[in-house]
Structures are given as C-alpha cells and as structure tokens.
C-alpha cells in the first residue's frame, strides 16, 4: 500500500506481485518524486483502494494504456 509519511509526498516501498484485471482499476497516478526510493504507479481500484505497482511490468503499462484510452473515450 502507498505510504504518506511526509505528506503531501506519497511513496511506494513495495509493489504488488499479483496481476490485477484492468476491470478492477479505476485510475492511476505516477510517483516520480526524488523524495521516494523508487518510481511507482499507484492504481486506485473500483472500490477506492490504492495499490502500488511497478511501472516496468508489462501488465502495469498495459493497464495504464487501457485507463488512458478509457478516459479519452467520451461516454455516449
């Protein structure tokens, strides 16, 4: 889980090693702060939980791409 020790900087110290279906993910944000030990992606799930993931993993990249497309597609 993300850790905000020195708010407002949120850092990830561990990544999930389970692949999560993109259909359980609602949004994401990238963590690139130099105050954090590693770059990370924090996914917010459909039930508003937050998951730290490794941006180098393919499933993470694919999920970000999917969520990007989802937000670009206007609902009819």
């Amino acid at each position: 889980q993300p850790d905000a020790i020195n708010a407002p900087v949120t850092c990830c110290y561990n990544f999930t090693n389970r692949k999560i279906s993109v259909q359980r993910l609602a949004s994401y944000r990238r963590i690139t702060s130099s105050k954090c030990p590693k770059e990370a992606v924090i996914f917010k799930t459909i039930v508003a939980k937050e998951i730290c993931a490794d941006p180098k993993q393919k499933w993470v990249q694919d999920s970000m791409d999917h969520l990007d497309k989802q937000t670009q597609t206007p609902k009819t």
Epitope: N17, R18, K19, I20, S21, R24, I46, V47, K49, Q70
Partner: antibody, heavy 119, light 113 residues
Framework: QVQLVQSGAEVKKPGASVKVSCKVS????????MHWVRQAPGKGLEWMGG????????IYAQKFQGRVTMTEDTSTDTAYMELSSLRSEDTAVFYC????????????WGQGTLVTVSS | DIVMTQSPDSLAVSLGERATINCKSS????????????LAWFQQKPGQPPKLLIY???TRESGVPDRFSGSGSGTDFTLTISRLQAEDVAVYSC?????????FGQGTKVELK
C-alpha cells in the same frame, strides 16, 4: 495452465482443527491470489476468504473470522486453509480457487477436500 | 454484504428445450465508469468442482458451448441454455465479484423432464 491439487479427505471430531493444502503447479503461488470456497452437503457455494491484492493481505468472510487461517508456503507453492473449533455444521467440501489475473471470479479450482466432522 | 438470490431453486426441462435461470443481487454490481457487471455463472456436476461458464455477466468462457448465454445488468441477471443437452444436467450458481465478500446464489438444479 494452472493446476491445483488438494490434500485428501479428513474426518475430525468436534472441537478439533483441520488443515487443508492446495499445491499449485504451472504457475508461481506468489503471483496468484488464492481463495477458499466451501460447500456443505446439498448446499450452495460459500466464499471463506483469500488473498486480496487490493488490500495487500488475506481477508476473511466475517462468518469465519477468528476461526480460519489461510497461509502460503511460497517455497513449495502450496496454500493452506486451517479451520479450528470444528462443529458438525462444518462438514463440507473445501475448494481452493484462483485466477491468473485477479478479478474476483475464479477459473481454476482444486478437486475439493471433504472434511467430515463427527463424534 | 451483497445477497444473491436465484430462481427457481430447480427446474425440469426436456432435451432440446430452453432453460432460463434468474439471479438477483441485493445491490447493483454494475460499475458505471466501465459499464461492466461484476457477475459470473458456474456449472457444477456431482463430485466435481464448479466450472466457470460466464463472466462480466455475458462473456462466455473459452470452450463453453454457445448454447450458454448470460444477460442482464445492475441487479437482474439471466443464464439461458438455449437447447438443453443431457450433459447440461447440473447445478448452476451466480457469483458477484464487485465488492468483498464475494457472494454466491444458492444454486439452481437443472434436471431432465
């Protein structure tokens, strides 16, 4: 292809504990979210709990809270479900179940382990 | 918890006829942002583990015959077997996977008439 092979049938006395194992092959347990489902004779399926990557921990159905413990031995790719303080109503088939990509439904199931609780 | 209620509890259908099973959830399992319904259907034969038939309410699992179809949205769902075969005699259960705890319907037993 994920394969789940469970331990054999058990007969237990009321008040005892039972530990059921589920051996994973074709995939690494640490990459899966293993869950456990039970089915009493002639009854429906009942989710007991499992590893929830959204929480980053194992979660349990309230009904079993305090009486069930689910653990993993990643060195042998084996998941375990221990149920304590057994009573006759716990007589059931217990299944481990998973999916390679966590969604909440399961496409791989163990063969089931019958646990009979009888004095 | 989301309560899943199936109807009927059992039904007898002639070979080649249609079987319809209903599943109702106590609250919506539709996530409006992606228009997905978090509902699955399973088939279970005696002495066997459940077999996934349908997920996302209407997506057929690979290898499942096309006589099985799922429909519905929100709180009301249906599993249809268009032309019942002898091997379809089983218990069918729905499951919601929107919010933990995951919950199943009580099951519907399909028999031959």
């Amino acid at each position: 292809q994920v394969q789940l092979v469970q331990s054999g049938a058990e007969v237990k006395k009321p008040g005892a504990s039972v530990k059921v194992s589920c051996k994973v092959s074709g995939y690494t347990l640490s990459e899966l979210s293993m869950h456990w489902v039970r089915q009493a004779p002639g009854k429906g399926l009942e989710w007991m709990g499992g590893f929830d990557p959204e929480d980053g921990e194992t979660i349990y159905a309230q009904k079993f809270q305090g009486r069930v413990t689910m653990t993993e031995d990643t060195s042998t790719d084996t998941a375990y479900m221990e149920l304590s303080s057994l009573r006759s109503e716990d007589t059931a088939v217990f299944y481990c179940a998973t999916k390679r990509e966590y969604s909440g439904y399961f496409d791989y199931w163990g063969q089931g382990t019958l646990v009979t609780v009888s004095s | 918890d989301i309560v899943m209620t199936q109807s009927p509890d059992s039904l007898a259908v002639s070979l080649g006829e249609r079987a319809t099973i209903n599943c109702k959830s106590s609250q919506s399992v539709l996530y409006s942002s992606n228009s997905k319904n978090y509902l699955a259907w399973f088939q279970q034969k005696p002495g066997q583990p459940p077999k996934l038939l349908i997920y996302w309410a209407s997506t057929r699992e690979s290898g499942v015959p096309d006589r099985f179809s799922g429909s519905g949205s929100g709180t009301d769902f249906t599993l249809t077997i268009s032309r019942l075969q002898a091997e379809d005699v089983a218990v069918y259960s729905c499951q919601q996977y929107f919010i933990t705890p995951w919950t199943f319907g009580q099951g519907t037993k399909v028999e031959l008439k």
